[in-house]
């Protein structure tokens, strides 16, 4: 039985192979039970967590994880050397930066050590699974009487990231948002000096260095407006 698994992270070529044992028709071998899907995320290209739902197993099982890179110099099968645990049962594996090769096909295999034929293999494009750290050091500059410029920093190469800026006033019920490319600058041309504004930003590893769907966490918000500091009306950055 060869089953295609569609993951929520753009890896449509992901496949899983489930190996069945021969069995009488009136009984179901444990080997037919599908293994949980493995979900991997690469955090800021610093480390990667590959996790699975250990509670989906009918009984507590320490599943094992192996990985390799398809058609590359790194095609030797590697054992997980740093397991993550949930209630003393393996639920994931953490790989360090030196083990992450973004543009090679990453193959991850989950196995039940008590039933070696019960295993599932997935192929992942790691460049589509990168989640950067949240933007930092948000600052606002007053360019003119009614124009504000928002700047921020990322702990990754700017040209690999796109951004989403959200802002609203205390009078608004919802956020207004705008996409920003790798230049990571945002201007608000018309600011009402009587209102207090809140801004926040998140970033994504797309489209230059990967095609990730997942955004970073939101930055800490930054505020501008009616209760701004009187000392310097041209630069004000207050983190909530």
């Amino acid at each position: 039985l060869n089953t295609t698994i569609l993951t929520p992270n753009g890896n449509e070529d992901t496949t899983a192979d489930f190996f069945l044992t021969t069995m009488p028709t009136d009984s179901l071998s444990v080997s037919t039970l599908p293994l949980p899907e493995v979900q991997c995320f690469v955090f800021n290209v610093e480390y990667m967590n590959c996790t699975w739902n250990s509670s989906s197993e009918p009984q507590p099982t320490n599943l094992t994880l192996h990985y390799w890179y398809k058609n590359s110099d790194n095609d030797k099968v590697q054992k997980c050397s740093h397991y993550l645990f949930s209630e003393e049962i393996t639920s994931g594996c953490q790989l360090q930066k030196k083990e992450i090769h973004l543009y090679q096909t990453f193959v991850v295999q989950l196995q039940d050590p008590r039933e070696p034929r019960r295993q599932a293999t997935q192929m992942l494009k790691l460049q589509n699974l990168v989640i950067p750290w949240a933007p930092e050091n948000l600052t606002l500059h007053k360019l003119s009487e009614s124009q504000l410029e928002l700047n921020w920093n990322n702990r990754f190469l700017n040209h690999c990231l796109e951004h989403l800026v959200q802002y609203r006033t205390d009078w608004d019920h919802s956020w207004t948002e705008q996409s920003v490319d790798y230049r990571h600058k945002f201007s608000l041309p018309s600011v009402d000096g009587q209102k207090r504004y809140t801004f926040r930003v998140r970033s994504r590893f797309n489209p230059l260095c990967g095609s990730a769907q997942h955004w970073s966490e939101w930055s800490h918000p930054i505020h501008w407006g009616s209760n701004t500091s009187k000392e310097n009306p041209f630069l004000f950055a207050l983190e909530a």
């Epitope: 290209v45 058609n71 543009y103 190469l157 489209p207 260095c209």
Partner: nanobody
Framework: QVQLQESGGGLVQPGGSLRLSCTAS????????MTWARQAPGKGLEWVST????????AYAASVEGRFTISRDNAKSTLYLQLNSLKTEDTAMYYC??????????PGQGTQVTVSS
């Protein structure tokens, strides 16, 4: 073994143009973003431009935007950089590198661009 060979540099007057090439081998060229960087005399390595693996997205340093154009031909495993409206401050050794320009792996041998009247 990854090999990158840059070519196309030379001496050019301010306002002139050059086209740099980088021929790659030893890896799956079409799977990787590719980057141009440069190093001026006595300066550190400066990122210039990066292109996505499929060529569909590009990014440029502010100092070269609008003057330089990065492109690639995956069938030929070749990366290009078109340099127009050259300025004296563009004088540098130009390197291509596999990936998005994080400094690993090391670039190739480079090609020298000198802008002088």
């Amino acid at each position: 073994q990854v090999q990158l060979q840059e070519s196309g540099g030379g001496l050019v007057q301010p306002g002139g143009s050059l086209r740099l090439s980088c021929t790659a081998s030893g890896f799956s060229f079409s799977s990787y973003p590719m980057t141009w960087a440069r190093q001026a005399p006595g300066k550190g390595l400066e990122w210039v431009s990066t292109i996505a693996s499929d060529g569909g997205s590009t990014a440029y340093a502010a100092s070269v935007e609008g003057r330089f154009t990065i492109s690639r031909d995956n069938a030929k495993s070749t990366l290009y950089l078109q340099l127009n409206s050259l300025k004296t401050e563009d004088t540098a050794m130009y390197y291509c590198t596999k990936g998005y320009g994080d400094g690993t792996p090391a670039p190739g041998q480079g090609t020298q661009v000198t802008v002088s009247s």
